[in-house]
């Protein structure tokens, strides 16, 4: 059985994982962003299911293609903060939630989805564990 | 002083459409970008659409995304808002206000909203 | 969307004393940047909104020190340390962190 500090560890991870997927979200959904246009034009892979946190492998799964329009974004008038890093960081909190006992083979859904809907499905789905947590 | 002054309102049928204009003086409008927001009858602020400093992007609300058109005219310090297909909902007071500003070495920077103005009335309605 | 949520709806107050309007956002407004871009807008009766305070507590030209803004992340707090006659009107709070949202409006009336 999950004990308290665990718990506590787990909400912890999760809540700077959603800092981190809300900063870049705020970094590229605003009229400022000179490359919106165009990266609103890659496609994403949504989970089929995302209620637990074994199904974050489908998060995972995507990083590599998130980091890959990220760097896109960067130009002298629009700044994230060093995409690699950030998606480093992303990964590693990922793996920890997630655990590597059993890798999941993740289902997605048949909807494609831009890059504002596939962060705010991951911001929601931080946001529905955080709640059950506390 | 910094001036916005919206024009172009008035009555409409549902279905019709309308042009708003916005006369800027008081600043370097090329250089600014400038938003849309509307106000229905005692109800509160929503954000229409927004147009970069050049006239590149443009940006809209879902409410009224294929419906609207935000445009600018830089050599007449005029920003338009052409309303096509109009519905009752559409019925507000409409302001133009004032975006970032674009500096030459390509940063956006300053208040957004920090100037509005009086506003012009459209009404939708048979 | 970001959803922003004002209370109270209403707030009757006596001149001279203070008010307090409080603002939520549905997700953190902290920028990639490193600012937040949370403003405050005040509107008087018949008149257009006019901004207050920009990225939180930065007060706008010509804005009397009565005002003042505060928080950080998802919570906000606009103070007016001393309401005064020409204070009456709706106040509402804005993110311009994505794509423009507005709190429904706070009403400050005197009682």
């Known amino acids: 059985a999950p004990t308290s500090s665990s718990t506590k560890k787990t909400q912890l991870q999760l809540e700077h994982l959603l800092l981190d997927l809300q900063m870049i979200l705020n970094g590229i959904n605003n009229y400022k962003n000179p490359k919106l246009t165009r990266m609103l034009t890659f496609k994403f892979y949504m989970p089929k299911k995302a209620t637990e946190l074994r199904h974050l492998q489908c998060l995972e799964e995507e990083l590599k293609p998130l980091e890959e329009v990220l760097n896109l974004a960067q130009s002298k008038s629009f700044h994230l903060r060093d995409t690699k890093d950030l998606i480093s960081n992303i990964n590693v909190i990922v793996l920890e939630l997630k655990g590597s006992e059993t890798t999941l083979m993740c289902e997605y859904a048949d909807e494609t989805a831009t890059i504002v809907e596939f962060l705010n499905r991951w911001i929601t789905f931080c946001q529905s564990i955080i709640s059950t947590l506390t | 002083q910094v001036q916005l002054v919206e024009s172009g309102g008035g009555v409409v049928q549902p279905g019709r459409s309308l042009r708003l204009s916005c006369a800027a003086s008081g600043f370097t409008f090329s250089s600014y970008a400038m938003h849309w927001v509307r106000q229905a009858p005692g109800k509160g602020l929503e954000w229409v659409a927004v147009?970069?400093?050049?006239?590149?992007?443009?940006y809209y609300a879902d409410s009224v995304k294929g419906r609207f058109t935000i445009s600018r005219d830089n050599s007449k310090n005029t920003l338009y808002l052409q309303m096509n297909s109009l519905r009752a909902e559409d019925t507000a007071v409409y302001y133009c206000?004032?975006?970032?500003?674009?500096?030459?070495?390509?940063?956006?920077?300053?208040?957004?909203?920090?100037?509005w103005g009086q506003g012009t009335l459209v009404t939708v309605s048979s | 969307d970001i959803v922003m949520t004002q209370t109270p709806l209403s707030s009757p107050v006596t001149l001279g004393q203070p008010a307090s309007i409080s603002c939520r956002s549905s997700?953190?407004?902290?920028?990639?940047?490193?600012?937040?871009?949370l403003s405050w807008l005040q509107q008087r009766p018949g008149q257009p909104p006019r901004l207050l305070i920009y990225e939180i507590s930065n007060r706008f030209s010509g804005v009397p020190d009565r005002f003042s803004g505060s928080g950080a992340g998802t919570d906000f707090t606009l103070k007016i340390s001393r309401v005064e006659a020409e204070d009456v009107g709706v106040y509402y709070c804005?993110?311009?962190?994505?794509?423009?949202?507005f709190g429904g409006g706070t009403k400050v009336e005197i009682k």
């Open positions: 147009i970069w400093y050049d006239g590149i992007n443009k």
């Open positions: 997700h953190n407004l902290l920028h990639s940047d490193g600012n937040t871009y």
């Open positions: 206000a004032r975006g970032s500003y674009y500096d030459s070495s390509g940063y956006y920077f300053g208040e957004d909203f920090d100037y």
């Open positions: 804005m993110q311009v962190t994505q794509f423009p949202t």
